[in-house]
């Protein structure tokens, strides 16, 4: 983060906790002004590296529901619908921030947590290791 | 989230703000115990729908740096290295949570914000619209 001389309009924080513990307003502001109908909604079926989405719910986490991608095949789907095992379907992973209730069950106290989620899959050329 | 009769060990919150404003510890806990060096690191080059990563920095946001994927081609790369325009490279997008300083420049007050980021690209069969 950044440390800027305190505005008089800023909520106060005791320096001993600063900037470790901050106040966060949970009323989410959505920057995606127009709901993008494309998003990734049908790509999981149309991709040459198709994936299934699995629901992961954890009430101690915020957001409590995360959908995780799992590639359907080791290889990639060819135009004829068969799987080409000379190519690899691999998950595209991203580290995201979530809020974890801490202490557990406390309704208004959280800790930032980084988790790795698989968002979708892509088809890559495999790395071939040549043995001498 | 969950609301359970308040633990005596929970930080207090005034009901008028509850559960809108919460305390968040910014000392990030990393659930990804072993940093996977593979992750998606080289997929952006090896993919049949390769992408470039663009740095997006915003000091009023936490995390301040986000890397965004942009597909290199409209089509997908074939085994011979040429681009097949009968297929489409498309971005895989994900909605993620970030913290936005609010009021602006305040070091210890944030609001949750949802933003749509492109994580990588995948190769899909195009949707063909047949005209009668």
């Amino acid at each position: 983060g950044i440390a800027i001389p305190r505005n008089s309009g800023c909520p106060n924080s005791e320096d001993k906790n600063f900037p470790r513990t901050v106040m966060v307003n949970l009323n989410i502001h959505n920057r995606n002004t127009s709901t993008n109908p494309k998003r990734s909604s049908d790509y999981y079926n149309r991709s040459t590296s198709p994936w299934n989405l699995h629901r992961n719910e954890d009430p101690e986490r915020y957001p409590s529901v995360i959908w995780e991608a799992k590639c359907r095949h080791l290889g990639c789907v060819k135009a004829d619908g068969n799987v080409d095992y000379h190519m690899n379907s691999v998950p595209i992973q991203q580290e995201i921030l979530v809020l974890r209730r801490e202490p557990r069950h406390c309704p208004n106290s959280f800790r930032l947590e980084k988790i790795l989620v698989s968002v979708g899959c892509t088809c890559v050329t495999p790395i071939v290791h040549h043995v001498a | 989230g969950i609301a359970i009769p308040r633990n005596s060990g929970c930080p207090n919150s005034e009901d008028k703000n509850f559960p809108r404003t919460v305390m968040v510890n910014l000392n990030i806990h990393n659930r990804n115990t072993s940093t996977n060096p593979k992750r998606s690191s080289d997929y952006y080059n090896r993919s049949t729908s390769p992408w470039n990563l663009h740095r997006n920095e915003d000091p009023e946001r936490y995390p301040s740096v986000i890397w965004e994927a942009k597909c290199r081609h409209l089509g997908c790369v074939k085994a011979d290295g040429n681009v097949d325009y009968h297929m489409n490279s498309v971005p895989i997008q994900q909605e993620i949570l970030v913290l936005r300083r609010e009021p602006r420049h305040c070091p210890n007050s944030f609001r949750l914000e949802k933003i749509l980021v492109s994580v990588g690209c995948t190769c899909v069969t195009p949707i063909v619209h047949h005209v009668a």
Epitope: I28, T35, R39, P63, V65, W67 | I2, A3, R20, K114
Partner: antibody, heavy 123, light 106 residues
């Protein structure tokens, strides 16, 4: 005002398929999952499954796996539930209901329900 | 799957009486939701995450419990409370509901 408006009643023959729609309004469609629940005449509630309109992710009750398909069209904020190979014991009122993925003042529960669609399976 | 068993199935109650409906789970669950349903109406969320009243629910209702045993209580029954009440768990797939408890006003 949050509303989930479902398609009208259907009468189907055994072995046929039915597709029920659920049009959402008054909220951001991709911020909530859509769950489907059914209720046979004079009986209790039975969970069929869920779709996340944002990702297209689905999770089905194993009892319906292979016979059910849930889809969502984010451009029209409409969710669909198709049930195939209908049997007489599929006669029920089918409800769609939303479930929050994010917070605000959300209860993380099925907080708004459609009016229900009666599906009658009879030869 | 987790089986939820409500008790009683049916109860005929006098106004102002205290009513207790129990929901017993075949395995431990994190939280319980409760829904109210009146004839020819869709279910309504009534109590969420064990003890929180949904918007518009009168304060005479309360919920409690943990593990396998959960309770919905009406402190002083009113005529408008006549309905069927269902408990519901979301701790494991498939999500399941209790068979329902029908409350009738004497």
């Amino acid at each position: 005002e949050v509303q989930l408006v479902q398609s009208g009643a259907e009468v189907k023959k055994p072995g046929a398929s039915v597709k029920v729609s659920c049009k959402a309004s008054g909220y951001t469609f991709t911020d909530y999952e859509v769950h489907w629940v059914r209720q046979a005449p004079g009986q209790g509630l039975e969970w069929i499954g869920v779709i996340d309109p944002g990702t297209g992710g689905v999770a089905y009750n194993q009892k319906f796996e292979g016979r059910v398909t849930m889809t969502a069209d984010t451009s029209t904020s409409t969710a669909y539930m198709e049930l195939r190979s209908l049997r007489s014991d599929d006669t029920a009122v089918y409800y769609c209901t939303r479930y929050s993925l994010f917070y605000g003042s959300s209860p993380y529960a099925m907080d708004y329900w459609g009016q229900g669609t009666l599906v009658t399976v009879s030869s | 799957e987790i089986v939820l068993t409500q008790s009683p199935d049916f109860q005929s109650v006098t106004p102002k009486e205290k009513v207790t409906i129990t929901c017993s789970a075949s395995s431990s669950v994190n939280y319980m939701h409760w829904f109210q349903q009146k004839p020819d109406q869709s279910p309504k969320l009534w109590i969420y995450r064990t003890s929180n009243l949904a918007s518009g629910v009168p304060s005479r209702f309360s919920g409690s419990g943990s593990g396998t045993d959960y309770t919905l209580t009406i402190n002083s029954l009113e005529a408008e409370d006549a309905a069927t009440y269902y408990c519901q768990q979301r701790s494991s797939y498939p999500w399941t509901f209790g068979q329902g408890t029908k409350l009738e006003i004497k």
